[in-house]
């Protein structure tokens, strides 16, 4: 049942004498495995025997017998899928039909494959794209319907018999669909390749020539042109004539139109291969070319640079850069249309010729303010001297110059004055727009460049200003030299080093930290009264009456400054002691009498002692001695003694008289 056998393989295989053939083949015998396989050459069915007759190239049977031809012909297949065959070497007489007789347990099949073996290697076939244009990449294909594992070959590309530099990509196919060897070459043809012969050469593994195919390239390209000019150097003077001729060296397809261009723009009514220019002017200087078109597009000749020579035109000056910053570099360029180019230049600054400047460019490495002004130039070539143009203005910018800080006040300045300063400068470009002051303070700027310091401090030493445009220039600091009253006046005790006792020699020093002007006077005062006019206040022998609050004053021409009040404390033993009696020095018996020990002491009395008329000390130690009730026997003279840390003092005697009461007198 034919429907059960399915084969896939190339319909025809090609080879040449001595080569080999590899036949890729697959099959499907659906009812079971292959049991017998015979390869026939040109098989014919014999109806009588119901078998095929023909040369048996290969036979595989159940008993495994193989004919001697088996060495040349190999069945590389299997019992159910693969039916690939190899004939190596292949011979001319192998051409014809190969018959694959397949038998399974129940079914039989004859599959036919055509084999075309030539006497000599057949040529490959070159395939070209339908149209080739210059500079457009194309792929050239060389195809050979042959490939065999046992017979390696190579395809080589040649251009005009010379191997091509471009790398070719070779591919091989040995499949049930196709058997071939292919070489592909990517190639960008130039117009010069037109008409050239391209060859694809088949070679064996050793590079021996086997066969080839050739094609002639048809490269479409724009017209290729040559331009000729009279005079040949294309250098003329105004009024001369010029002839230009355009020649086509190649065009594929043929050209259709001709035109001429100057500086890329088409010249009207110039459609012949010759361009005649009569009595040329300088405006006709430029780059000329001819343009010829075909179906591919326009082709242009090389450009001819026509130079119409003339004397320099009025010059202009270009400045790099203006405005310029002082100290920077500046370049001046003299621009003058001329042909040939000027060979000599004359430069002018503010109308005055600049000596030694003959170049097109003038370079000033370090610009100074005096370089500002108008720059102009004159250009000169072999045909004459040009005119001086309008010139260009160089603006030199620089920080303010000669900045000074000026004190507007009459001198001297006194502490507390309002000081006005101005910031002056000599010149500036651009104009001064602002001012800065050092040190910074909460000061007024009533107008631009004027500083007002209200209530100037004694310690305001120097002030500096800066005038600023794009830059700030600082003036040297100016000394305000503020005059002020003496500062930090204080009283300092020089002697004694310890506490002051009555009778000590005492010296007080009046110190101050600074004064401007330096010439000073000293004054000492106690409770508003002037005591001395020296820096020291001396007491040869201090007394308690000298104690109190002292201040020293230091005067200069600006004012006077006082110290803080300084307390002078004098320590002394109790003095001026006296005994006072209350209610009086005569008291009636039975009443109360209080004796008080009054004294003057510093520090105050800490201990009192009472004595009677016999100088007997009494057992009382407080300031007051209270006698209650007072008796007649208490009559007599009393005195007291006071003690402090400095010493002792005693009072004179005070007499207490105690008289009898009326009752006592009545009883007597």
């Amino acid at each position: 049942d034919s429907s059960k056998w399915v084969f896939e393989h190339p319909e025809t295989l090609y080879a040449w004498e001595g080569a080999c053939v590899w036949i890729p083949c697959t099959y499907r015998a659906l009812d079971g495995d292959l049991e017998s396989f015979i390869l026939f050459h040109n098989p014919e069915y014999n109806k009588n025997t119901s078998k095929f007759d023909g040369t048996r190239l290969y036979e595989s049977t159940k008993d495994g017998k193989v004919p001697s031809e088996q060495k040349r012909v190999q069945f590389l297949g299997d019992k159910n899928k693969n039916c690939t065959l190899s004939i190596h070497p292949v011979h001319l007489n192998d051409s014809g039909q190969l018959g694959l007789r397949m038998e399974s347990k129940t079914e039989k099949w004859m599959e036919r494959i055509h084999l075309n073996v030539s006497e000599r290697p057949f040529p490959p076939h070159i395939q070209l794209p339908p149209e080739i244009q210059e500079s457009q990449e194309v792929t050239l294909t060389c195809l050979l319907n042959f490939s065999c594992y046992g017979y390696p070959i190579q395809l080589q590309w040649l251009l005009e018999g010379v191997p091509m530099r471009q790398a070719a990509v070779t591919s091989t196919s040995l499949t049930i669909k196709s058997v071939f060897t292919r070489s592909e070459l990517k190639f960008s043809p130039q117009w010069s390749h037109h008409g050239k012969i391209v060859t694809c050469q088949l070679q064996d593994a050793d590079g021996k020539f086997l066969s080839n195919d050739t094609v002639q390239l048809n490269v479409k390209h724009t017209p290729k042109l040559e331009i000729k000019v009279t005079p040949s150097d294309a250098i003329v003077r105004e009024g001369d004539s010029v002839t230009m001729t355009c020649e086509v060296s190649s065009s594929n397809p043929e050209y259709t139109t001709v035109s001429w261009l100057k500086d890329g723009t088409s010249l009207k009514k110039q459609n012949t291969f010759t361009l005649n220019l009569r009595e040329v002017t300088k405006d006709q200087s430029g780059k000329y070319c001819c343009q010829v078109s075909n179906d591919v597009g326009p082709g242009r000749s090389e450009e001819v640079f026509l130079q119409v020579q003339y004397a320099p035109e009025p010059s202009t000056v270009q400045i790099l850069h203006s405005p310029a910053v002082e100290g920077s570099q500046v370049e001046f360029l003299c621009m003058s249309l001329a042909n040939p180019l000027p060979t000599n230049y004359t430069w002018y600054h503010n109308g005055k010729e600049m000596q030694g400047r003959t170049e097109e460019k003038v370079h000033i490495p370090k610009i100074l303010p005096w370089h500002a002004g108008t720059y102009s130039c004159v250009a000169e070539n072999i045909l004459g001297t040009g005119q001086r143009g309008p010139g260009a203005e160089l603006d030199v910018q620089y920080p303010p110059k000669k900045v000074t800080t000026v004190i507007q006040n009459p001198m001297p300045i006194r502490e507390g004055d309002t000081v006005t300063l101005s910031c002056n400068y000599n010149s500036s470009n651009p104009s001064v727009t602002r001012y800065e002051w050092k040190p910074h303070g909460a000061w007024e700027e009533p107008s631009l460049g004027v500083l007002k310091i209200q209530n100037v401090g004694w310690d305001n030493t120097t002030i500096a200003c800066a005038a600023c445009n794009s830059w700030c220039s600082w003036a040297s600091p100016v000394a305000l030299n503020v005059q002020y009253a003496p500062r930090d006046v204080r009283v300092r005790k020089i002697k004694p080093l310890s506490e002051i006792h009555s009778g000590n020699s005492v010296s007080l020093q009046c110190d101050f930290s600074s004064s401007h002007p330096k010439e000073v006077q000293f004054f000492w005062e106690k409770n508003g009264r002037l005591l001395g006019k020296e820096s020291q206040l001396n007491f040869d022998s201090i007394s308690p009456e000298d104690a109190g609050s002292y201040s020293c004053w230091v005067n200069n021409s600006i004012g006077q400054t006082a110290s803080k009040a300084w307390t002078l404390e004098v320590l002394y033993a109790p003095r001026r002691l006296r005994v006072s009696m209350s209610p009086g020095d005569q008291v009636m018996e039975g009443k109360s009498a209080t004796l008080t020990c009054e004294s003057d002491a510093n520090p105050p009395v800490s201990h009192y002692t009472w004595f009677d008329w016999n100088n007997q000390s009494l057992p009382y130690h407080s300031q007051k001695l209270r006698l209650e009730p007072v008796k007649v026997q208490h009559s007599g003279a009393y005195w007291c003694q006071g003690t402090n840390s400095v010493g002792k003092g005693r009072s004179p005697l005070s007499t207490l008289t105690v008289y009898y009461s009326p009752e006592t007198i009545g009883r007597r």
Epitope: E525, R529, L530, G548, N555, A565, T567
Partner: antibody, heavy 113, light 107 residues
Framework: EVQLQQSGPVLVKPGASVKMSCKAS????????MNWVKQSHGKSLEWIGI????????SYNQKFKGKATLTVDKSSSTAYMELNSLTSEDSAVYYC??????WGQGTSVTVSS | DVQITQSPSYLAASPGETITINCRTS??????LAWYQEKPGKTNKLLIY???TLQSGIPSRFSGSGSGTDFTLTISSLEPEDFAMYYC?????????FGGGTKLEIK
């Protein structure tokens, strides 16, 4: 007896100046400092400044610098105070005082347009 | 400058009573504080200086105390002539400064 006799009351226009006097007697004028004190109506006392009657050296309260100027004439034992650029804020009674112990009776200054 | 706070600003008392007036300074002034009495039609009278020193001719019922920043004027056994305005003043350093005053009135 120490006495400080001050000049009489004054009425002045704003912007004007006034100079008042304080004549001392009963002590050696140049031996003592002289203080000046301001008392605005219904307010406390403000110390203006002090002058050394011997040297003429002065010391001012910062508040009154530029407003008050103190001087002395030793030959007449008189102290002076000049107030300038007067405004209504300067309307007050002004006292001279020898230290703190003796005071003048005061000079009334009224600033009004 | 040294600031002085005087209290009370107003005080009513009866003759024979004892009263105190206080002054506090913004910084230490040692003991250099004075007390004045101000009466209409009379010149200001110095009562006490250096905190506690009684000015000559002033009755002993007036006394002063304190040092550093806190000071007190005491009038013991008030007399009718004592009803007046009282001011304290520091004389430790210039500028001298005064308290706001205390008005002593008869109750």
């Amino acid at each position: 007896e120490v006495q400080l006799q001050q000049s009489g009351p004054v009425l002045v226009k704003p912007g004007a100046s006034v100079k008042m006097s304080c004549k001392a007697s009963g002590y050696t004028f140049s031996d003592y400092f002289m203080n000046w004190v301001k008392q605005s109506h219904g307010k406390s006392l403000e110390w203006i400044g002090i002058i050394n009657s011997y040297s003429g050296g002065t010391s001012y309260n910062q508040k009154f610098k530029g407003k008050a100027t103190l001087t002395v004439d030793k030959s007449s034992s008189t102290a002076y105070m000049e107030l300038n650029s007067l405004t209504s804020e300067d309307s007050a009674v002004y006292y001279c005082a020898r230290w703190m112990d003796y005071w003048g009776q005061g000079t009334s200054v009224t600033v009004s347009s | 400058d040294v600031q002085i706070t005087q209290s009370p600003s107003y005080l009513a008392a009866s003759p024979g009573e004892t009263i105190t007036i206080n002054c506090r300074t913004s910084e230490s002034i040692s003991k250099h504080l004075a007390w004045y009495q101000e009466k209409p039609g009379k010149t200001n009278k110095l009562l006490i200086y250096s905190g506690s020193t009684l000015q000559s001719g002033i009755p002993s019922r007036f006394s002063g105390s304190g040092s550093g920043t806190d000071f007190t004027l005491t009038i013991s056994s008030l007399e009718p002539e004592d009803f007046a305005m009282y001011y304290c003043q520091q004389h430790n350093e210039y500028p001298w400064t005064f308290g706001g005053g205390t008005k002593l009135e008869i109750k």
